[in-house]
């Protein structure tokens, strides 16, 4: 039975040209995390494999950085980065847990700064 839950940063906003940290945290399970995948809509951005470490998708290497922890840092944000992001925790023996984050990239300098884990 899958008992775990994923806590995420939820809905967050950031300014165009800035950076943001996407964070998920898996709790309430003793399952072993074998890999975490970070996805944006239909694209895999990065993976963090327990054995092999971090690997950033070649098409995102210039704008995505690993961490902190199992999180992901997006840099040089554009309005096109607005959308849904997913953290997929592959675990043993539980299976897969998925968390969702919605990022809005704002043109103006009035981006809300209330979200946790956000880079000032």
């Amino acid at each position: 039975m899958m008992t775990g839950t994923i806590e995420t940063t939820g809905n967050i906003s950031a300014e165009k040209g800035g950076s943001i940290i996407l964070q998920c945290h898996l709790s309430s399970t003793t399952a072993q995390v074998t890999q975490v995948n970070w996805e944006q809509q239909d694209q895999l951005l990065a993976i963090c494999n327990a054995d092999l470490g971090w690997h950033i998708s070649p098409s995102f290497k210039d704008r995505v950085a690993p961490g902190p922890g199992l999180g992901l840092t997006l840099q040089s944000l554009t309005v096109n980065d607005t959308g849904e992001y997913f953290c997929i925790y592959h675990t043993y023996p539980d299976g897969t847990y998925t968390g969702r984050i919605f990022l809005e990239v704002l043109e103006s300098s009035v981006a809300e700064h209330g979200a946790r884990f956000q880079i000032p």
Epitope: N37, Q43, L44, N49, D51, G53, H55, S57, P58
Partner: antibody, heavy 117, light 107 residues
């Protein structure tokens, strides 16, 4: 020029072990994964396992766990794949490949391993 | 393990015509699919990564598409040197499983 040069063909008896080497050159050995893939006669390509030469971390396909060991020697930029308890079904061409996790961009020339009594 | 199912098993196409190969994943793999060309007596060669990105030096007659579970490799105008077996492979999670291969021949 990136190159992966594998050791020569091997003939082994059932129950024996084989160790295939893969010498890398032309790039920073510790910056890429080394993957091992095999192809038995008439079969599809089969991924066996991978090593991160920088950290030494390995990941194996479940069916090979306990029978395969992948290692890397940073000083000589060489990766090794050892397969034990050989059986006839292990007769195949074994390839090493440089991995970016998301793809394998350079491959060794392949090493034919024949298991026969 | 994620199962990659390729179709068709073999394909005979006239020179200059289009060849289309399909690959279906047993579960979601995002765009983490690569395509390889394998000729007899040679090592496999990378053609496409991340479903649709052409690898350096690969002719532009090769293209890839798809996301989620369904993927396609297209050779827009088949050349004699394209006769080979083509494999898809998922890189979404280990083990990085391959499809069964599609043999492309000249009609």
């Amino acid at each position: 020029e990136v190159q992966l040069v594998q050791s020569g063909a091997e003939v082994k008896k059932p129950g024996a072990s084989v160790k295939v080497s893969c010498k890398a050159s032309g790039y920073a050995f510790t910056n890429y994964l080394i993957e091992w893939v095999r192809q038995a006669p008439g079969q599809r390509l089969e991924w066996m396992g991978v090593i991160n030469p920088g950290s030494g971390g390995t990941n194996y396909k479940e069916k090979f766990k306990g029978r395969v060991t992948i290692t890397a020697d940073k000083s000589s930029s060489t990766a090794y794949m050892e397969l034990s308890s050989l059986r006839s079904e292990d007769t195949a061409v074994y390839y090493c490949a440089r991995g970016e996790y998301f793809f394998f961009d350079y491959w060794g020339q392949g090493t034919t391993v024949t298991v026969s009594s | 393990d994620i199962v990659m199912t390729q179709s068709p098993d073999s394909l005979a196409v006239s020179l200059g015509e289009r060849a289309t190969i399909n690959c279906k994943a047993s579960q979601h793999v995002s765009n983490a699919v690569a395509w390889y060309q394998h000729k007899p007596g040679q090592s496999p060669k990378l053609l496409i990564y991340s479903a649709s990105y052409r690898y350096t030096g690969v002719p532009d007659r090769f293209s890839g598409s798809g996301s989620g579970t369904d993927f396609t490799l297209t050779i827009s105008s088949l050349q004699a040197e394209d006769v080979a077996v083509y494999y898809c492979q998922q890189h979404y999670n280990t083990p990085h499983t391959f499809g069964g291969g599609t043999k492309v021949e000249i009609k």
